[in-house]
């Protein structure tokens, strides 16, 4: 363990890991839910590791495949994360910004249809206010950068430099609420290219740009089967 | 196993059109794109294009006009077809399956463009 | 479209010596992947998203950059490693492959 910085050692040796690139490193290769300590050593927060796609270490924010979670929650929840790690969940947007306090994150976006076609994005940087102060007061800005196409087509570089936005705390640039026009909560801008915390709906859709969308793939009238969100350092 | 083939015609005229087929198996072409990569003798790698999961497809702008791809997913199969060919089209042509990158290529046909 | 210029073209070394292969991008890109291939022999994928080993690929190689600067390493050369070295990027279509390095052992 030579070389590694003193946090770092710290987390090592106490076995208190800060995502699942350091799961990985205690040598727990497989998909499933495991501890992190991203604000220190008291406070557990169970995460979905996906240690298997494209060489794994992925720590997963947000996951949703069958609409058994309501998605369509307050800044509250959002802020500090609600559902359960093995099945759909928001792993909590102050939970988001320790992360990438610390470490520098790439992000991965994997998507499916109702017709079992899966896609994804990438993007090389991804951080959550990673200059402010307060990160509640600046919003939890987004940060992505570095796209690179797996299918999906880029939906998220439209919302970079937003504030997030729930029905309760309305942030967008939009003269009405993006998050309860759209039912869902987002980075919104006015209003989006992706409401991955969208409605359920379940394939193709009538009412326009409410559902899991990601315009760039599957436009504003269809709503995906599965969506992860997740980070790794890079 | 992922594996990918490639089958062509090997011997086009100038002017022809090719065509080949990619038949894949040990992974489902609803969960991997496939990408094309062509290779001139005693040259450098050049990207054709690649079909996505859903059909969606991209090209090289540089031989968009004259290349086509698609595929049959029931069948596992990929199709690259190009008109017009030239002798510079003369070349081992690969299809490579996506994530991460291009993790598996074929073994690639070779296709030479003479009269 | 994003041009990738490798240097060098051709590098002959001795095996344990240290080897970097440079790909320079006429703009910025997201990451780069390396491919190793041997005459007569696919492509095979080295290194993604710049700095992941593919699988089966010795820790003696690793990759590194950004921006419009990336490179490939091995810090021990090893006879098995003599082939030609291609980057590649995929931030913008159409996908662009460098020009190759080739490496020969002496």
């Known amino acids: 363990v030579s070389g590694i910085r003193g946090d770092a050692l710290e987390r090592f040796c106490l076995q208190q890991p800060l995502d699942c690139d350091d799961i990985y490193a205690q040598g727990y290769q497989s998909d499933g839910v495991y501890l992190i300590y991203p604000s220190g050593p008291s406070v557990p927060v169970p995460v979905f590791c996906d240690m298997t796609t494209e060489g794994g270490k992925w720590t997963v924010f947000q996951k949703r495949f069958n609409g058994s979670v309501s998605f369509f929650r307050g800044w509250n929840d959002y802020k500090l994360g609600f559902g359960r790690a093995d099945g759909e969940y928001w792993l909590g947007l102050q939970n988001m910004h320790l992360l990438t306090l610390k470490q520098k994150y790439e992000l991965r976006v994997d998507l499916e249809d109702f017709e079992n076609n899966t896609a994804y994005a990438k993007y090389a940087d991804f951080s959550i206010s990673p200059n402010a102060v307060s990160a509640e007061e600046d919003g939890y800005t987004l940060f992505v950068a570095g796209f690179e196409d797996g299918g999906a087509g880029d939906s998220l570089s439209y919302h970079s430099g937003q504030k997030f936005s729930t029905f309760d705390r309305d942030q967008d640039l939009f003269v009405q609420n993006c998050a309860a026009l759209s039912s869902g909560a987002f980075w919104f801008r006015s209003c989006h290219f992706a409401n991955l915390n969208g409605f359920y709906l379940g394939g193709s859709h009538l009412s326009y740009a409410n559902g899991i969308n990601w315009a760039q793939w599957k436009g504003f009238y269809y709503s995906l089967k599965r969506t992860e969100m997740k980070i790794r350092r890079a | 196993e992922v594996q990918l083939e490639e089958s062509g015609p090997g011997l086009v005229a100038p002017s022809q059109s090719l065509s080949i087929t990619c038949t894949v198996s040990g992974f489902s072409l609803t969960r991997y794109g496939v990408h094309w990569v062509r290779q001139p003798p005693g040259k450098g790698l050049e990207w054709l294009g690649v079909i996505w999961t859903a059909g969606n497809t991209n090209y090289n702008s540089a031989l968009m006009s004259r290349l086509s791809i698609s595929k049959d997913n029931s069948k596992t199969q990929v199709f690259l077809k190009m008109n017009s060919l030239q002798t510079d089209d003369t070349a081992m042509y690969y299809c490579a399956r996506d994530d991460p990158s291009m993790a598996y290529w074929g073994q690639g046909t070779s296709v030479t463009v003479s009269s | 479209d994003i041009v990738l210029t490798q240097t060098p073209a051709i590098m002959s070394v001795s095996p344990g010596e240290k080897v970097t292969i440079t790909c320079s991008a006429s703009s910025s890109v997201s990451y780069m992947h390396w491919f190793q291939q041997k005459p007569g022999t696919s492509p095979k994928l080295w290194i993604y998203s710049t700095s992941n080993l593919a699988s089966g690929v010795p820790a003696r190689f690793s990759g590194s950059g950004s921006g419009t600067s990336y490179s490939l390493t091995i810090s021990r050369t090893e006879a098995e490693d003599a082939a030609t070295y291609y980057c590649?990027?995929?931030?913008?279509?159409?996908?662009?492959f460098g020009g190759g390095t080739k490496l020969e052992i002496k």
């Open positions: 590649q990027q995929r931030s913008s279509y159409p996908y662009t």
